[in-house]
């Protein structure tokens, strides 16, 4: 039975009965705000295998595991997300483990597991087996792992039942609970799912199947479901619906959903039954179910009740899909996100006109504004204080506004303001002044030449390397001495270097927004002798590792024709020499007879060169009877120190301050104080948490029904 269009279970745990016959929830599942601790053991929904949108759990007292409720939940498709997330577990006071031992695939979106004071078995789940990208998962403020004592099945008895994978260089057993392993399919299946007996499913199956190589035995479908079969595409006279199944024209014609009630009904376009015609198309007549291409962009006026629309996530951008004219102001505040540029372009790429102002601030996830690919007019009918209609503040990774060679943007009224955009060259801003017709409107402080582009390459001259020398952990490089028109303007050089396994890095790498600069920086003073070429010894490097290196001249700000001059090199790729490898990992030995030992190991994590052979040494040792006196693995021997309070554990979010032994007789050093950048990152992290929490509360707290 398909249940839909989204199930909201709140206040009364007995509402869970609504899930009784559901095999697929076409939409979301909310279980929330059940404040009285109940016994959930009698509630079990083994039929539920798929949720097409997202699963949200919030403040459900007494619920200790999801495994008993949803033992067969296999796929969360994430067709629509809750603030970029397909699985949200937030403030679940009694939840001890997630326990969704059959969950094999989250097709789209990330997970957010936060402020669950008693929640363990988080570090034992390998989310990379379930999600495509784990970088946007947010798992914070749960029970500290060291207080959990998570043991996978069989570990205590020294008969581990679960498989191992590597997460953050830690090779460990993967499980959901003390008695449920995380299922992994044989490598022979490739990306295919598998049965409980490790037989490979049909390629059209997703998550699992009840019989091998059978497209009618899938638990969920990789593409579409029709008449009991998983199909790669919907058959003739049927149409894709909600991203997972095929429906006929009559079904599509009759849909009356709360979301679409104001529209003229669903349409069929490009083989899909959808709420509206997609970008670039319009209905073929007011009541038609079919779409035709627009001549030029289709007109769609969108208005924001509150005048200012805040875009702080994919979800908020979704509201603007198809809009060509936005009546109001746009405030863009994108701190993080997966594949954010293409998602924003998908939802905001048709906007041509903004009647008010556009403000972009703290959008560290943005590298460019090109996602507003059709924006051609900012009217500035409403302006920010100071008469600004285009305002760009503190965007740590913004490097490009638009491609001005292919962009015609007019700002009809109002000024522009740019500050604290360290990777945005001032030349790019000046170009925008010319294109938009705002040149002359800005006063001197409106475009800050000191803190815009300060960390960008806005140079015009090229520095050339003259020599490179390598050892196992050092690189020595020299380059031509740069001679600016006025030699006094050259202050020093900055060398940027980073590991680069492939020769494909750019200066802006590692800033795919959502991250700080990934380059290491070293300042190099000018050699006193004018005939000596500047150079540097980079030390503390890894053996047999390719590095990317480039150099920038640090000059006084010299404005020539309104452009800042300077110099930098091309990126140079250079590999350090080989060295002794690190120790082999996971050495295991077992005896298969009275005179033989079988020894297995994994390659070293740092080969430091091309491995050619291993040396195995062994020696006889006396038996130590003391080792057998205690069972160190016994679960009840693990000290449980304190009950986590569900607040953010500082140790989780930031590294422990490390004490280092310094040279000579100095003794241990103090931990370094946090840098401004670290403090700023923590502040932004806290801000991001608040934004999410506000979004959560605004979404789920609704007036009581009549």
């Amino acid at each position: 039975e398909i249940c839909g269009p989204g199930i909201d279970i709140r206040n009364d745990y007995q509402q869970l009965k609504r899930l009784e016959n559901c095999t697929v929830i076409e939409g979301y599942l909310h279980i929330l705000l059940i404040s009285k601790a109940e016994d959930y053991r009698s509630y079990r929904f083994p039929k539920l295998t798929v949720i097409t949108e997202y699963l949200l759990l919030f403040r459900v007292a007494g619920l200790e595991s999801l495994g008993d409720l949803f033992p067969n939940l296999t796929v969360i498709r994430g067709w629509k997300l809750f603030y970029n997330y397909a699985l949200v577990i937030f403030e679940m006071t009694n939840l001890k483990d997630i326990g969704l031992y059959n969950l094999r695939n989250i097709t789209r979106g990330a997970i957010r597991i936060e402020k669950n004071a008693d929640l363990c078995y988080l570090s034992t789940v390998d989310w990379s087996l379930i999600l495509d990208a784990v970088s946007n998962n947010y798992i914070v403020g749960n029970k500290p792992p060291k207080e959990c004592g998570d043991l996978c099945p069989g570990t205590m008895e020294e008969k581990p039942m679960c498989e191992k994978t590597t997460i953050n260089n830690e090779y460990n057993y993967r499980c959901w609970t003390t008695n449920r392993c995380q299922k992994m399919c044989p490598s022979t299946c490739g990306k295919r799912a598998c049965t409980e007996n490790n037989e490979c499913c049909h390629p059209e199956c997703l998550g699992s199947c009840s019989a091998p190589d059978n497209d009618t035995a899938c638990v969920a479908c990789r593409h579409y479901y029709y008449a009991g079969v998983c199909v790669p595409a919907c058959p003739p006279n049927t149409y894709r619906f909600e991203g997972w199944r095929c429906v006929d024209r009559d079904f599509c014609a009759n849909i009356l959903s709360a979301e679409s009630s104001d529209s003229e009904g669903f349409v069929i376009h490009d083989g899909e039954c959808m709420q509206e015609c997609p970008s670039g198309f319009i209905r073929n007549g007011s009541q038609s179910m079919y779409c035709i291409p627009c001549e030029g962009p289709c007109p769609k006026v969108c208005e924001e009740e509150k005048k200012t629309k805040t875009i702080d996530s994919v979800t908020s951008a979704q509201m603007l899909q198809g809009c060509t004219i936005f009546k109001g102001n746009l405030l863009i505040n994108i701190r993080r996100g997966n594949n954010i540029a293409s998602e924003l372009e998908n939802f905001m790429g048709l906007i041509e006109v903004v009647t008010g102002y556009v403000k972009i601030r703290h959008s560290h996830a943005l590298v460019s504004l090109s996602f507003l690919k059709n924006l051609r007019l900012i009217l500035g009918e409403e302006q920010l204080e100071g008469n600004y209609s285009f305002y760009v503040l503190d965007n740590q990774n913004l490097q490009q506004l638009w491609d001005w060679d292919h962009r015609n943007l007019t700002i009809k009224a109002g000024k522009m303001y740019f500050a604290f955009n360290p990777k945005l060259c001032v030349s790019e801003i000046y170009r925008m002044e010319e294109v938009t017709g705002t040149k002359g409107r800005q006063s001197k402080g409106d475009i800050n030449t000191r803190n815009n582009g300060e960390r960008a390459s806005c140079e015009s001259d090229v520095l050339h390397f003259t020599s490179t020398t390598t050892s196992k952990n050092r690189i020595i490089i020299t380059w031509h001495r740069y001679r600016p028109p006025d030699y006094r303007d050259l202050i020093s050089f900055t060398v940027y270097y980073k590991e680069a396994p492939f020769k494909n890095v750019t200066e802006y790498d590692g800033q795919d927004a959502c991250g700080s600069n990934s380059w290491n920086m070293v300042d190099v003073d000018l050699p006193p002798n004018k005939d000596v070429e500047p150079g540097i010894l980079l030390h503390g490097l890894k053996p047999w590792t390719q590095y990317a290196v480039y150099v920038k001249a640090v000059t006084l700000t010299m404005v020539e024709n309104d452009h800042i001059r300077g110099a930098k090199s091309e990126i140079l790729y250079i590999r350090t020499n080989a060295s002794v490898p690190s120790i082999p990992l996971d050495v295991l030995s077992a005896s298969n007879s009275s005179s033989q030992l079988i020894v297995k190991w994994n390659p070293p994590s740092l080969p430091n060169g091309n491995l050619s052979y291993y040396i195995v040494r062994w020696q006889r040792q006396p038996q130590d009877g003391y080792l057998y006196r205690h069972n160190y693995c016994s679960k009840d021997k693990i000290p449980i120190r304190k009950y986590a309070d569900g607040t953010i554990d500082i140790e989780e979010v930031t590294e422990n301050p490390k004490t280092e032994v310094c040279g000579g007789e100095k003794g241990p050093c103090c931990a370094c104080p946090k840098t401004e950048a670290e403090k700023q990152a923590e502040k932004e992290e806290a801000e991001y948490r608040k934004v999410f929490e506000n979004f959560l509360h605004n979404s789920i707290f609704v007036p009581r029904p009549e």
Epitope: A253, N254, L256, S257
Partner: antibody, heavy 117, light 112 residues
Framework: QVQLQESGPGLVKPSETLSLTCTVS?????????WNWIRQPPGKGLEWIGY???????NYKPSLKDRVTISRDTSKNQFSLKLSSVTAADTAVYYC??????????WGQGTLVTVSS | DIVMTQSPLSLPVTPGEPASISCRSS???????????LQWYLQKPGQSPQLLIY???NRLYGVPDRFSGSGSGTDFTLKISRVEAEDVGVYYC?????????FGQGTKVEIK
Amino acid sequence: QVQLQESGPGLVKPSETLSLTCTVSGYSITGGYLWNWIRQPPGKGLEWIGYISYDGTNNYKPSLKDRVTISRDTSKNQFSLKLSSVTAADTAVYYCARYGRVFFDYWGQGTLVTVSS
Amino acid sequence: DIVMTQSPLSLPVTPGEPASISCRSSQSIVHSNGNTYLQWYLQKPGQSPQLLIYKVSNRLYGVPDRFSGSGSGTDFTLKISRVEAEDVGVYYCFQGSHVPHTFGQGTKVEIK
């Protein structure tokens, strides 16, 4: 996959109130569609009584408006019919049905209510 | 209220022969959006009604192509090109364009 099931007393005394409940499974009544009551006196045709929409708004047949109330219980995913001051003329098979943008796509199997003393 | 009048009220048919049912509305049932929400339902003995045709002429997926609907404004027709034994039952027209929605009084189709 969507199922509607009528329930309620099969016998009601004249002048009393007829009360029926339709339990919906497979679709949330707040998610969309119009949730209707239709009746059919024995050997006669179908008569539309009224509906409650996904947002809780009602529409009734004018000739029954003074006696009819359609309400819902979203927590149980049910909607109900109350018909007051019943007479023998209200004896019928009562159906609940879901109406979309264009047509009735799901019907209950119907329940016979007899008005008799 | 819009009154929907069907004729004939009873229609004895021979299998393999065509049949036609008329439905007239007391006023136009064209909705303000331009659509005409007229449907035809068949109620077989002891069963709930089932949809055959919607919006005057759209045959529901899975309904045999011997059934067809036509008409506009106030005059509508359901045709069965070759009646089969399984087609017996009461046929109702229904208008959903204006509230209150109304059914026709029904046409009983039976085999001669």
